[in-house]
């Protein structure tokens, strides 16, 4: 079998809401993946599991099941959304994200994603990690790749 390539493209959008009483930030982060099937037969993308970390704390998890089938030598772009919560244990972040004296409230999040594919009963897992900038101060849509954090901090491919 040839490889199945998973490429994390970046954050597509981040929608933010707040609970001032509990100093909580809710961020719905939509990410984009490109999955390429280099085989001469179809493969099934069985599930995608994702988690988001802020400052070594997991702030959100998501799992998508029975996603799609990718045909021979084909590529599909898949969007997945991770709902995240930065709760009052990090209430200083609420103050930062709602500070009106600054325009952009970028925070660095680590995006982790694992894609499970199956073909002929065989299962394969491919994982990616990426640091991304996300603006926690407003709803934002990004050009793909625009939210990339400094490349030097990215894990090796």
């Amino acid at each position: 079998p040839r490889s199945i390539d998973v490429k994390y493209i970046g954050v597509k959008s981040a929608y933010v809401s707040y609970d001032v009483q509990k100093r909580t930030i809710y961020l719905n982060i939509t990410n984009t993946l490109n999955i390429t099937n280099n085989n001469y037969y179809s493969v099934e993308v069985e599930n995608i599991t994702a988690q988001v970390q802020f400052s070594k704390t997991v702030i959100g998890k998501a799992r998508l099941n029975n996603i799609t089938i990718i045909g021979p030598l084909d590529m599909k772009q898949i969007d997945y959304t991770v709902p995240t919560v930065i709760a009052e244990e990090m209430s200083y972040m609420y103050d930062f994200c709602t500070l009106i004296s600054i325009k952009v409230h970028n925070i660095v999040l680590m995006m982790q994603v694992t894609v499970t594919t199956t073909y002929f009963g065989h299962s394969e897992q491919i994982s990616q990690e990426r640091y991304q900038y996300v603006d926690c101060g407003r709803n934002t849509t990004y050009q793909l790749g625009q939210s990339e954090y400094l490349n030097v901090l990215q894990p090796q491919q």
């Epitope: 509990k22 809710y26 709760a87």
Partner: antibody, heavy 117, light 112 residues
Framework: QVQLQQSGPELVKPGASVKLSCKAS????????VNWVRQRPGQGLEWIGW????????IYNEKFKGRATLTVDTSSSTAYMELHSLTSEDSAVFFC??????????WGQGTSVTVSS | DVLMTQSPLSLPVSLGDQVSISCRSS???????????LEWYLQKPGQSPKLLIY???NRFSGVPDRFSGSGSGTDFTLKISRVEAEDLGVYYC?????????FGGGTKLEIK
Amino acid sequence: QVQLQQSGPELVKPGASVKLSCKASDNTFTNYDVNWVRQRPGQGLEWIGWIYPRDGTTIYNEKFKGRATLTVDTSSSTAYMELHSLTSEDSAVFFCARTLPQAMDYWGQGTSVTVSS
Amino acid sequence: DVLMTQSPLSLPVSLGDQVSISCRSSQTIVHRNGNTYLEWYLQKPGQSPKLLIYKVSNRFSGVPDRFSGSGSGTDFTLKISRVEAEDLGVYYCFQGSHLPWTFGGGTKLEIK
């Protein structure tokens, strides 16, 4: 230790308004929220409302909406609650409480309000 | 509104006793952010309430370790392992998860 000093007892006529104050011993109200709580004689505690001093955002118990007005003067670290259209049902002790996201950690000593003609 | 029901209403004790106070909410009080904002306050006669426990089981600073909180979902308990004279008063549970925030009716801890 944070101390919240509330204004003295009030005797007011039915239909009138009263404005109670709650002064912090430090500049606590620039960093913390304030809740107000009512306790009728021999009764339990009832949450009135909450204020976020940084921008004056308020949230009220529906029961008190339109009758209670919460404000904060951060320069003097004083919180205020004004209660309008008082009836005998409003005769109670009113407490202010400094509030973290997790809980009401320090309370004032309470202000007694008596509504009587 | 979330109704907070405490039991018993009155709890006669002897000094040194271990006691439990129950608090039941009419619906789950897990906040949208995942935390459970269940607090316990003690009000001594003629005084303002004092915070004992926050977020179900966290003791507030200066609160003796004979006080402990537990529970989840809709059922919560405050335990006092050895009652002392200074513990007498009315105990209130409180939920700060769903608006309007609500108190329980109170449990009066008194000497037998």
